[in-house]
Interface confidence: low
């Protein structure tokens, strides 16, 4: 049975050129995480797998950082940049957690989380 | 145990340099990433920089081109060189394990002024 939950960010905005961390933790569950995929819509941004270490998608790589944590770090945001971003949590023998975080980037030079690079 | 001592901070004149080493011990240091963060005074830790095992870097907009990252797997110790440094870039620098970032070190004072 499938007791973890996933904490996410949740909804978070950031301005155009800036940085942002997306960050989900797993919590609630004894299971062994074995891979954490972050995705972009349909797009693999990054791995990172707890044998191998991290894996950036070489599309990405010049523009995201692995963490910290298992979280992940984007940077010179572009308003392209908006949208769904999903934290796959692979575990065992639990299965697939996956989080939700929705990214805005702004044009003005106030965003609503403004705080960038912060460690909760 | 698993243990990261950093090293190397001091007072320094804006436009000067330093570097930073941290020491890993109790863990396969080349199995992680490694990353520097730092806490201004009054200021919440922040992201500086972040070296992967294979080589690859990333930094903070704010020290992109000043500040260099980089890893001896042989030594277990990852270093930041740190150039053209400004008033603002005082803080107690943090190395961290990069994988859960469950282990810190004690911190290094950088202070940069004239």
């Known amino acids: 049975m499938m007791t973890g939950t996933i904490e996410t960010t949740g909804n978070i905005s950031a301005e155009k050129g800036g940085s942002i961390i997306l960050q989900c933790h797993l919590s609630s569950t004894t299971a062994q995480v074995t891979q954490v995929n972050w995705e972009q819509q349909d797009q693999l941004l990054a791995i990172c797998n707890a044998d191998l270490g991290w894996h950036i998608s070489p599309s990405f790589k010049d523009r995201v950082a692995p963490g910290p944590g298992l979280g992940l770090t984007l940077q010179s945001l572009t308003v392209n940049d908006t949208g769904e971003y999903f934290c796959i949590y692979h575990t065992y023998p639990d299965g697939t957690y996956t989080g939700r975080i929705f990214l805005e980037v702004l044009e003005s030079s106030v965003a609503e989380h403004g705080a960038r690079f912060q460690i909760p | 145990e698993v243990q990261l001592v950093e090293s190397g901070g001091g007072l320094v004149q804006p436009g000067g340099s330093l570097r930073l080493s941290c020491a890993a011990s109790g863990f396969v240091f080349s199995s992680d990433w490694m990353g520097w963060f730092r806490q201004a005074p009054g200021k919440e830790r922040e992201w500086v920089a972040s070296?992967?095992?294979?080589?690859?870097?990333w930094y903070a907009d704010s020290v992109k081109g000043r500040f260099t990252i980089s890893a001896d797997n042989s030594k277990n110790t990852a270093y930041l060189q740190m150039n053209s440094l400004k008033p603002e870039d005082t803080a107690v620098y943090y190395c961290?394990?990069?994988?859960?970032?469950?282990?810190w070190g004690q911190g290094t004072l950088v202070t940069v002024s004239s």
């Open positions: 070296v992967l095992r294979g080589g690859y870097t």
């Open positions: 961290a394990r990069g994988d859960s970032m469950d282990v």
